[in-house]
């Protein structure tokens, strides 16, 4: 019998100040190309190594963002994604939706050698 | 392995126009980005125009805006750059590059290290 994957959706607001390179992540997405499924929303696919975010490890590769300085990122072309982050000033808030994976195995089951069976 | 040759440039006098052009091959076209870059004597490289298959949109730095337009061409592999109203200041070895990174969209600023092919530069000199 194999464990159910559940999933603890949690959202953050992350406030980034923008480096000497930018922000430092990509992101895929939007209403012309959906990343997910039934879903046009904007998401992490890429963090860069020393880049503004890496920098402050809150931001993760598959979060979902949800707004960038109070601007809804809901059916948004890709590109005007793209350019809102690129416009998005000095000091960039984002709000972000991170989804951790819960890994949940069947009930009554123990791993072999567990002493507290 | 992805080639980049520039040509188009020249000794122009303040005013005039000049067309780049950059020829890709070896590899496919449909990259995510092309883009334009320039280095003047004793300065760094500088962005100057990019060009996005993503809607195909374009970008431009504040320097260019209004005088430069890129374009590109599918069918012959080849990016181009129309700079009209030349200055002095616009002479520079100028650049072509190509982005290949799948991973989604940079949200950053086109910046040369985002770039994985470079052609060998055309020198513009504006008298």
């Known amino acids: 019998m194999n464990g159910r994957v559940d999933y603890l959706v949690t959202e953050e607001e992350i406030n980034l100040t923008r480096g000497p390179s930018g922000l430092g992540f990509n992101i895929v997405g939007g209403t012309d190309q959906q990343y997910v499924s039934n879903d046009s929303g904007i998401y992490v696919s890429r963090i860069k190594e020393n880049g503004a975010a890496a920098l402050d490890g809150r931001l993760q590769e598959g979060d979902k963002i949800l707004s960038v300085n109070g601007q809804d990122l809901k059916n948004l072309l890709h590109q005007d994604a793209v350019d809102l982050f690129r416009n998005a000033g000095y000091a960039v808030s984002l709000r972000v939706q991170h989804r951790l994976q819960v890994q949940n195995g069947p009930i009554g089951h123990r791993g072999e050698g567990d002493p507290s069976g | 392995h992805v080639q980049l040759v520039e040509s188009g440039g020249g000794l122009v006098q303040a005013g005039a126009s000049l067309r780049l052009s950059c020829a890709a091959s070896?590899?496919?076209?449909?990259?995510?980005?092309m883009a334009w870059f320039r280095q003047a004597p004793g300065k760094e490289r500088e962005f100057v125009a990019e060009d996005s298959w993503s809607n195909h949109r374009v970008w431009y730095s504040d320097s260019v805006k209004g005088r430069f337009t890129i374009s590109r061409d599918n069918a012959k592999n080849t990016v181009y750059l129309q700079m009209n109203n030349l200055k002095p200041e616009d002479t520079a070895v100028y650049y072509c590059?190509?982005?290949?990174?799948?991973?989604?969209?940079?949200?950053?600023?086109?910046?040369?290290?985002?770039?994985?092919?470079w052609g060998q530069g055309t020198q513009v000199t504006v008298s």
């Open positions: 070896g590899g496919t076209f449909s990259s995510y980005a």
């Open positions: 590059a190509d982005y290949r990174d799948y991973s989604g969209s940079t949200v950053d600023p086109p910046n040369q290290s985002e770039y994985d092919y």
